[in-house]
């Protein structure tokens, strides 16, 4: 578990926000990936295929995302997270069978504003 | 797994640094708690008792810490963690028997400094 998670960079910076990457096996063809923030579903992306191998992507929570053949990346704006939040990637595999549900990588994200920054803010008009 | 980790705030801020809390059962009397950063042992705290019930605390890596009857908290300075690191609390239980080793809470930590802060820093001489 340590090796798997340590080898997978879950969080990174992207255009002033945070990119949260949820990896999955390349063999997975149809899936639902949910991103939890603590107990709340923050993002929900479903990729399915119709009878003619046509792809449908559903993103009901309108999260900015990037989908590849082995990962879903969600892009979050900077929320106030000074308490820290636990983010979890939860994967439902529809295809190939059998249907499976798996909690994948999980991690804490702290939005940190340095003390100097906070002091400087006091000087702003 | 989601509930357990979400209920336990592994990371929090403390005096401009990060506090990493490693919880353990209150029944444990003698223990070793190691904090891993990715695959590296960052902190190593051992609590044992002598024949007269005298307590010995060993902290060979000189990590600032706080010990209670159910947790060990390690205090880290803000290292450059913009890449993110996986932290794991690993517990060895000496007493009560039998001897056990357990990986406890693990979490991915990304220290993020807000853009405003970074912009302000550029203005400093």
């Amino acid at each position: 578990e340590l090796n798997d998670l340590a080898n997978h960079r879950m969080f990174s910076f992207h255009d002033g926000g945070v990119q949260i990457s949820c990896n999955y096996p390349e063999t997975v063809q149809q899936l639902k990936m949910q991103l939890f923030k603590d107990r709340e579903v923050l993002c929900d992306l479903t990729k399915t295929k119709g009878s003619g191998n046509t792809v449908s992507i559903k993103n009901p929570m309108s999260c900015p995302y990037q989908l590849s053949n082995n990962s879903v990346s969600f892009f979050l704006d900077n929320a106030d997270s000074s308490q820290g939040s636990y983010f979890l990637c939860s994967l439902s595999i529809f295809d190939p069978p059998p249907f499976q549900e798996k909690n994948l990588s999980g991690g804490y994200l702290l939005i940190y504003e340095s003390q100097l920054c906070c002091q400087l803010k006091l000087w702003l008009p | 797994e989601l509930n357990d980790l979400a209920n336990h705030r592994m990371f929090s801020f403390h005096d401009g640094g990060v506090q990493i809390s490693c919880n353990y059962p209150e029944t444990v009397q003698q223990l070793k708690m190691q904090l891993f950063k990715d695959r590296e042992v960052l902190c190593d705290l051992t609590k044992t008792k002598g024949s007269g019930n005298t307590v010995s605390i060993k902290n060979p890596m000189s990590c600032p810490y706080q010990l209670s009857n159910n947790s060990v908290s390690f205090f880290l300075d803000n290292a450059d963690s913009s890449q993110g690191s996986y932290f794991l609390c690993s517990l060895s239980i000496f007493d009560p028997p039998p001897f056990q080793e357990k990986n406890l809470s693990g979490g991915y930590l990304l220290i993020y400094e807000s853009q405003l802060c970074c912009q302000l820093k550029l203005w400093l001489p």
Epitope: T27, Q29, Q30, T46, T48, K49, G50, S51, G52, N53, T54, S56, K58, F94, D95, P96, P97 | -
Partner: antibody, heavy 117, light 111 residues
Framework: EVQLVESGGGLVKPGGSLTLSCAAS????????MDWVRQGPGKGLEWVGN????????YYAPFVKGRFTISRDNAKKTLYLQMNSVKSEDTATYYC??????????WGQGTLVTVSS | DIVMTQSPSSLAVSPGDKVTINCKSS??????????LAWYQQKTGQAPKLLIF???TRHTGVPDRFMGSGSGTDFSLTINSFQTEDLGDYYC?????????FGPGTKLEIK
């Protein structure tokens, strides 16, 4: 248990219109692509078209050529096939099917559409 | 469009016989590790029923005498010991691209 029940078939004149319905139960209807497949008398199976989970995308067989429209009402758990400008060659039993991710895993009993003057 | 062909078009069989039905596609149905091909059984007056998906995986509840095999463009459905309840029409179907198409069918009759 998954159930699909078609209705609305019958006799229709060439050039006329007809709407078939398919009532679904026993599964989360809004999670699945749905299809219509037809079978002419004494003939093989022929795919008509499909619709994605929320009804935003549809695909049709070439013979449809804008004459048929597939839609769905997820609140009512119902699939529809609106048939316009029907021809005699549209005479067939029309099956409502669930696309179970990698095959048609559930079928209705079918409803017969006869196009004749 | 991908064209599916089946052989034979009909077959007279006896209970206990080993039966093989062939299906050929006009282009490969292999994508990744999977062949996008399914087999269906249709008894007289009934709707079709799914037997096999991904060329060789039996659907839930399908007896193990039914076996699917093949890859690429050539596939077969084998009934290891034919039973009278297996009478009916058998169709292969691809879902490699739109439109998904069915083979013309193979009718199994009692000898």
């Amino acid at each position: 248990e998954v159930q699909l029940v078609e209705s609305g078939g019958g006799l229709v004149k060439p050039g006329g219109s007809l709407t078939l319905s398919c009532a679904a139960s026993g599964f989360t209807f809004s999670d699945y692509w749905m299809d219509w497949v037809r079978q002419g008398p004494g003939k093989g199976l022929e795919w008509v078209g499909n619709i994605d989970e929320d009804g935003s995308t549809t695909y049709y067989a070439p013979f449809v050529k804008g004459r048929f429209t597939i839609s769905r009402d997820n609140a009512k758990k119902t699939l529809y096939l609106q048939m316009n400008s029907v021809k005699s060659e549209d005479t067939a039993t029309y099956y409502c099917t669930r696309w179970g991710r990698y095959a048609f895993d559930s079928w209705g009993q079918g409803t017969l559409v006869t196009v004749s003057s | 469009d991908i064209v599916m062909t089946q052989s034979p078009s009909s077959l007279a069989v006896s209970p206990g016989d080993k039966v093989t039905i062939n299906c050929k596609s006009s282009q490969s149905l292999l994508s990744g590790n999977y062949n996008y091909l399914a087999w269906y059984q249709q008894k007289t007056g009934q709707a079709p029923k799914l037997l096999i998906f991904y060329a060789s995986t039996r659907h839930t509840g399908v007896p193990d005498r039914f076996m699917g095999s093949g890859s690429g463009t050539d596939f077969s459905l084998t009934i290891n010991s034919f039973q009278t309840e297996d009478l009916g029409d058998y169709y292969c179907q691809h879902h490699y691209s739109t439109p998904p198409t069915f083979g013309p069918g193979t009718k199994l009759e009692i000898k």
